[in-house]
Amino acid sequence: QLPPGKPEIFKCRSPNKETFTCWWRPGTDGGLPTNYSLTYHREGETLMHECPDYITGGPNSCHFGKQYTSMWRTYIMMVNATNQMGSSFSDELYVDVTYIVQPDPPLELAVEVKQPEDRKPYLWIKWSPPTLIDLKTGWFTLLYEIRLKPEKAAEWEIHFAGQQTEFKILSLHPGQKYLVQVRCKPDHGYWSAWSPATFIQIPSDFTMND
């Protein structure tokens, strides 16, 4: 029977800068029941606080709701593991909410084959930003990436769309059924999951771009 091993805070994420969650990995339990607590203080403070919500984020997590989340202050946090034989602490972790944003996937993905008479046909892809993200404040710049492939193909073709919410693709294989997905990333944060796939049938008379 031993004191617990050193825990590690290995992930913090925020969907929108208004709330966030951090997760830790327990060290060895020393063969005894072990209690974990996350404590934190904010920059410029010495007063330590305990995690406000151990439930919402699931096991070994701490969730900071709206009233506990500030974009203006860095959080300095650590996890304490305690059993009957002693305690151990994780390394301190500095968390700036701006740098942990991982948005939900973009919404309303629409895909359409356009065949103008005077120009080459193309695939037109359009989407909307995730609802939780407020782009009007200027705090967020969202970048988008599209991936598509014929239904039976193994490899995805990836296109970076920058900040635009629509995109044209010219080079496609006629007669194939394509899967299309989109994801987004704030300029300082993490890529979202890919949106659910949208399927589109490319007509057989679709002319490949040279």
Epitope: E8, F10, K11, C12, K17, R25, E43, G44, M71, W72, T74, D91, L93, Y94, V95, D96, T98, Y99, I100, G138, W139, K185, H188, Y190, W191
Partner: antibody, heavy 118, light 112 residues
Framework: QVQLVQSGAEVKKPGSSVKVSCKAS????????MHWVRQAPGQGLEWMGV????????NYNQKFKGRVTITADESTSTAYMELSSLRSEDTAVYYC???????????WGQGTLVTVSS | DIVMTQTPLSLSVTPGQPASISCRSS???????????LHWYLQKPGQSPQLLIY???NRFSGVPDRFSGSGSGTDFTLKISRVEAEDVGVYYC?????????FGGGTKVEIK
């Protein structure tokens, strides 16, 4: 404890490439972005770029765009910085550096001296 | 790119005496999120740089309270209230509000 251990010193010819490695330990490698910073002899520090090892997203200083490539190998918890078309002005100590969930550098490698000389 | 200008280039200080280093940026360093990402690093002889102060005025963990940072907009200052022998090295200011992140040219602090 967090450690960043870099590869050894290199001597390279002008026009060639160099690849410096940075092996991370003491934390989950894919959890934090890894930056590269260089320091020419007797000079200041210069940020080169960054990688998110969880999905290999990179962002480079435009000054090095096209010459620098930052990669990461999750299986060995190692980040790499490759600089091509070397010139004498690239003679410098190259550092890998990790932040927390922040935009300052909390941990630094010991540095790798790259000398470019004919 | 944001240019960070440090003054003086070097400082020779008697132990126990104060020291002050100035850093001026070519543009305001207020991020769109309201934070000012101006930091100070110390590079001791033969070592890698180490973080002293983050976001203008916050001492990093383990940094003695004789170090303090202040400033806003484009003008920032690092002060050492009583210089000790272990404080020798080159001090760098750094901004990470705008990409590419940039550093000042450094201020070398020596003991008299």
């Amino acid at each position: 404890q967090v450690q960043l251990v870099q590869s050894g010193a290199e001597v390279k010819k002008p026009g060639s490439s160099v690849k410096v490695s940075c092996k991370a330990s003491g934390y989950t490698f894919t959890s934090f972005w890894m930056h590269w910073v260089r320091q020419a002899p007797g000079q200041g520090l210069e940020w080169m770029g960054v990688i998110d090892p969880s999905d290999t997203y990179t962002n480079y200083n435009q000054k090095f765009k096209g010459r620098v490539t930052i990669t990461a190998d999750e299986s060995t918890s190692t980040a790499y910085m490759e600089l091509s078309s070397l010139r004498s002005e690239d003679t410098a100590v190259y550092y890998c550096a990790r932040g927390d969930y922040s935009n300052w550098f909390t941990y630094w490698g010991q540095g790798t001296l790259v000398t470019v000389s004919s | 790119d944001i240019v960070m200008t440090q003054t003086p280039l070097s400082l020779s200080v008697t132990p126990g005496q104060p020291a002050s280093i100035s850093c001026r940026s070519s543009q305001r360093l207020v991020h769109s999120n309201g934070n000012t990402y101006l930091h100070w690093y110390l590079q001791k002889p033969g070592q890698s740089p180490q973080l002293l102060i983050y976001k203008v005025s916050n001492r990093f963990s383990g940094v003695p309270d004789r170090f303090s940072g202040s400033g806003s907009g484009t003008d920032f200052t690092l002060k050492i209230s009583r210089v000790e022998a272990e404080d020798v090295g080159v001090y760098y200011c750094s901004q990470s509000t705008h990409v590419p992140w940039t550093f000042g040219g450094g201020t070398k602090v020596e003991i008299k």
